[in-house]
Amino acid sequence: AGYVFRDKVMSEFNNNFRQQMENYPKNNHTASILDRMQADFKCCGAANYTDWEKIPSMSKNRVPDSCCINVTVGCGINFNEKAIHKEGCVEKIGGWLRKNV
């Protein structure tokens, strides 16, 4: 039962994270939550940073600044892969959830 619950939590978190990405950066509250998660967990996007390319409000050469290894204003514009966290947040935060939930 514990594994089923854990998988459900992971699935819900994945769906929710992707849903929140769709609202970035239009919704300030959503943006600050996602930015906080990406910065704290050193991750970018749901599965990986390329998820941000699919967000209509984001230019294809852009990720949120919170994806950057060294976060500065505008660091996510015209980003270099070497300068951002490439691991996705669902897996990264999921690992933390598995340990702590």
Epitope: N61, I77, N78, E81, K82
Partner: antibody, heavy 119, light 108 residues
Framework: QVQLVESGGGLVKPRGSLRLSCAAS????????MNWIRQAPGKGLEWVSY????????YYADSVKGRFTISRDNAYNSLYLQMNSLRAEDTAVYYC????????????WGQGTTVTVSS | DIQMTQSPSSLSASVGDRVTITCRAS??????LNWYQQKPGKAPKLLIY???SLQSGVPSRFSGSGSGTDFTLTISSLQPEDFATYYC??????????FGQGTRLEIK
């Protein structure tokens, strides 16, 4: 020294194919995005395609989409452009260009290789 | 797509003149604007990046300014080797990477 050397250009018939290569030296190749930029005779600069450090992300100008394919081999410090279904309007000098990204500008350009599409 | 428009398209000037070339973006590009110089039969060369930063090895007579949509490249005192074609380019929103149509600087 930092260098990009293109090869593979030449004369090809319409609807033909050609593969351009670019050999990079003097820098850590996978630290950079790479571009192909072309210049038709007497015309300005036109971006053709770019590829990310790892090769995961590739984009193309609308004028070449579906006909050209960019790729890279980081183990061999090489960039490629496979050009299929060539048209007369693809006639140009093709430059291999290094791109550090962010706001730094495209800082290293090859000498260019000439592609002529004519029957 | 962001369009880049340069003016003038050609310009005649003399050695020692102060020359200004302008570049306008169709929407704000912050300071993500680069300038290149190209001589006949040669590859372009990066002169200015981030609107106003001089690329290493480029003479200090070249300078860039502007932010948002309007940018200028200034050559304070033209030298014989400066007669060439100049291009602006934006990297704020790509793809596509877009260039201005070029400004040809000729000897008067």
């Amino acid at each position: 020294q930092v260098q990009l050397v293109e090869s593979g250009g030449g004369l090809v018939k319409p609807r033909g194919s050609l593969r351009l290569s670019c050999a990079a030296s003097g820098f850590i190749f996978d630290d950079y995005f790479m571009n192909w930029i072309r210049q038709a005779p007497g015309k300005g600069l036109e971006w053709v395609s770019y590829i990310s450090n790892s090769g995961n992300t590739k984009y193309y100008a609308d004028s070449v989409k579906g006909r050209f394919t960019i790729s890279r081999d980081n183990a061999y410090n090489s960039l490629y452009l496979q050009m299929n279904s060539l048209r007369a309007e693809d006639t140009a000098v093709y430059y291999c260009v290094r791109d550090p990204r962010s706001y730094y500008g495209m800082d290293v350009w090859g000498q260019g290789t000439t592609v002529t599409v004519s029957s | 797509d962001i369009q880049m428009t340069q003016s003038p398209s050609s310009l005649s000037a003399s050695v020692g003149d102060r020359v200004t070339i302008t570049c306008r973006a169709s929407q704000s590009i912050s300071s993500y604007l680069n300038w290149y110089q190209q001589k006949p039969g040669k590859a372009p060369k990066l002169l200015i990046y981030a609107a106003s930063s001089l690329q290493s090895g480029v003479p200090s007579r070249f300078s860039g300014s502007g932010s948002g949509t309007d940018f200028t490249l200034t050559i304070s005192s033209l030298q014989p080797e400066d007669f060439a074609t100049y291009y602006c380019q934006q990297s704020y929103s790509t793809p596509p990477i877009t260039f201005g149509q070029g400004t040809r600087l000729e000897i008067k």
